[in-house]
């Protein structure tokens, strides 16, 4: 941070030290030096001497004027030329900032990732403000009218343990900086409706050695309660389009899904489930890559190094896609 300096005078800014970008700005310098009747007063911005738009107002005071100031941040200081002194004498310094009032936060969403213990709310902050802007998330119980506030930057994690006022809430975010304040629209949430179930896991795959080779995918849904509706999507890695297989299940143990696939091909599998009566699907599971054997008579056997490396790499790349947008196709 900037070290404070002992001023031998005063420096001030009109309309203020923080102002709207594009405004005309005047920076004033008033010296109070002992044994000095300054020949000149000089202004420096970010360490560079200003050459233009400097006005000497009186013996002790000068002003520099900026038309349409558009620097997000600048450090100003002023000096005096004192007769008989070789160097300029420092008078005072000031940090100035320009920016914008905040936009009203938009597209607010709140979700509870299963087992996280938090309600995560995000929003669009709008155009950059360039100045320090605080966001306060307001959570109001529709049952008890109790209201809580959480300070944030561009998202917030609220412990579900702190949401003691029932299941229904109003949530909104307020953006505040030195130039203004805006509120988002209010979002009504029911805690049970915003749970994003944790993803299912595909644990392994095997292709049986038979006349018509059959691939079995082993997977487990983490949804514990009641009936579950699941989808498994799969495609050859060379293809763009997915095939989707649907399942109704109420099992919590490992599932087996059978597929009849082309030999000597690399396939990617993903699964997701939705509890009946629930709004939210799980995100797609991490991509699982399986290579089918060359012919019907050949038993699957992986060389120990190279293919595994490829699978890991593929999964990593896919994961980046699938987690950023659950509906987005992969590959």
């Amino acid at each position: 941070g900037i070290a404070t300096i002992n001023c031998s005078g005063n420096m001030w800014v009109e309309p203020g030290e923080i102002f709207q970008m594009g405004m005309n700005v005047s920076v004033y310098c008033q010296e109070a030096l002992k044994n000095c009747r300054p020949r000149n007063l000089h202004f420096y911005k970010n360490g560079f001497k200003e050459r233009f738009h400097i006005t000497r107002i009186n013996r002790t005071t000068a002003r520099v004027w900026y038309k349409g100031f558009s620097e997000p941040h600048a450090s100003m200081y002023c000096t005096a030329e004192c007769p008989g002194r070789f160097q300029e004498t420092l008078i005072c310094g000031k940090d100035i900032s320009s920016g914008y009032p905040p936009d009203a936060p938009s597209n607010m969403t709140c979700v509870i990732y299963e087992y996280s213990g938090n309600m995560t709310c995000t929003w669009n902050t709008g155009k950059p403000t360039y100045i320090d802007t605080k966001y306060t998330v307001h959570v109001k119980s529709l049952e008890t009218e109790e209201q809580q506030q959480y300070l944030a930057s561009n998202y917030v994690n609220i412990s579900t343990d702190s949401l003691q006022g029932g299941r229904k809430y109003l949530v909104w975010v307020q953006a505040v900086n030195a130039l203004g304040m805006e509120n988002s629209q209010q979002l009504q949430v029911h805690l049970d409706d915003i749970v994003i179930p944790s993803p299912s896991i595909i644990s392994r795959a095997e292709t049986t050695n038979a006349n018509v080779p059959k691939t079995i995918i082993y997977w487990k849904s983490k949804i514990m309660t009641g009936k579950v509706f699941c989808e498994m999507r799969y495609k050859a890695t060379t293809n763009q389009t997915w095939n989707v297989k649907e399942f109704d299940t109420n099992y919590t143990y490992v599932q087996q899904s059978e597929f009849y696939l082309e030999p000597n091909s690399k396939y990617v599998f993903q699964v997701r489930c939705q509890g009946t009566g629930k709004r939210n699907w799980q995100p797609w599971s991490s991509p699982f890559v399986h290579q089918t054997p060359q012919t019907a008579s050949q038993v699957t056997s992986k060389p120990p190094h190279e293919p595994q490396k490829i699978e890991m790499l593929t999964a990593t790349i896919f994961k980046g896609h699938s987690t950023s947008d659950n509906s987005q196709d992969i590959g």
Partner: antibody
């Protein structure tokens, strides 16, 4: 963690042009003045360009004035150096550097990128 | 332009001993009661790293064995005790006025 990553270097013939980029992360880019500094094959360091936080003020040494243009895009957190009429003496490693003020009047290059190499040769 | 002259061009120091690098400016780099003199360390394949600013202030995370002194035109960087990791090039730089200028560097090696 403050990170500056330069790109765009390469080989150019004398009289040619090239644009360097520097992607900044880990700090509020728009609040800092920035510079480009180059290092010759003989390891000499030379400051070549300065830009203010909003891009309104730029300064250059005489050796590159009129040939180099520094600019920035605060929305993209990126600093640029457009170089034209290149000469063999411009051959160097080009670093982007963040300029921090420790007082209103004392500024220091406190973080540097890893650099990108420019070779000017016929 | 302010010319910065560094000496020696190279220096070999034993582990635990003191290394002293000097830098002379062609004119005073003092103003407002401080010296606009900075020191950088550069290891092979890496960018310069700020060690000392305003002649004697340590940069962030810089070990206490690095210290700077001087004013006006004459400055020095001291490293004591010398460690293996200190093998590098060292540059002085003035930030008093543009163009900001650097010394030619001192190569510090382990004896």
């Amino acid at each position: 963690e403050v990170k500056l990553v330069e790109s765009g270097g390469g080989s150019v013939k004398p009289g040619g042009s090239l644009k360097l980029s520097c992607a900044a992360s880990g700090f509020t880019f728009s609040r800092y003045t920035m510079s480009w500094v180059r290092q010759t094959p003989e390891k000499r360091l030379e400051w070549v360009a300065y830009i203010s936080t909003g891009g309104g003020d730029t300064y250059y040494p005489d050796s590159v004035k009129g040939r180099f243009t520094i600019s920035r895009d605060n929305a993209r957190n990126t600093l640029y150096l457009q170089m034209s009429s290149l000469r063999s003496e411009d051959t160097a490693m080009y670093y982007c550097a963040r300029r921090t003020s420790y007082s209103y009047y004392n500024y220091v290059f406190d973080y540097w990128g890893q650099g990108t190499t420019l070779t000017v040769s016929s | 332009d302010i010319v910065m002259t560094q000496s020696p061009a190279s220096l070999a120091v034993s582990l635990g001993q003191r290394a002293t690098i000097s830098c002379r400016a062609s004119e005073s780099v003092d103003n407002y009661g401080i010296s606009f003199m900075n020191w950088f360390q550069q290891k092979p394949g890496q960018p310069p790293k700020l060690l000392i600013y305003a002649a004697s202030n340590q940069g962030s995370g810089v070990p206490a064995r690095f210290s700077g002194s001087g004013s006006g035109t004459d400055f020095s960087l001291n490293i004591h005790p010398m460690e293996e990791d200190d093998t590098a090039m060292y540059f002085c730089q003035q930030s008093k006025e543009v163009p900001w200028t650097f010394g030619a560097g001192t190569k510090l090696e382990l004896k």
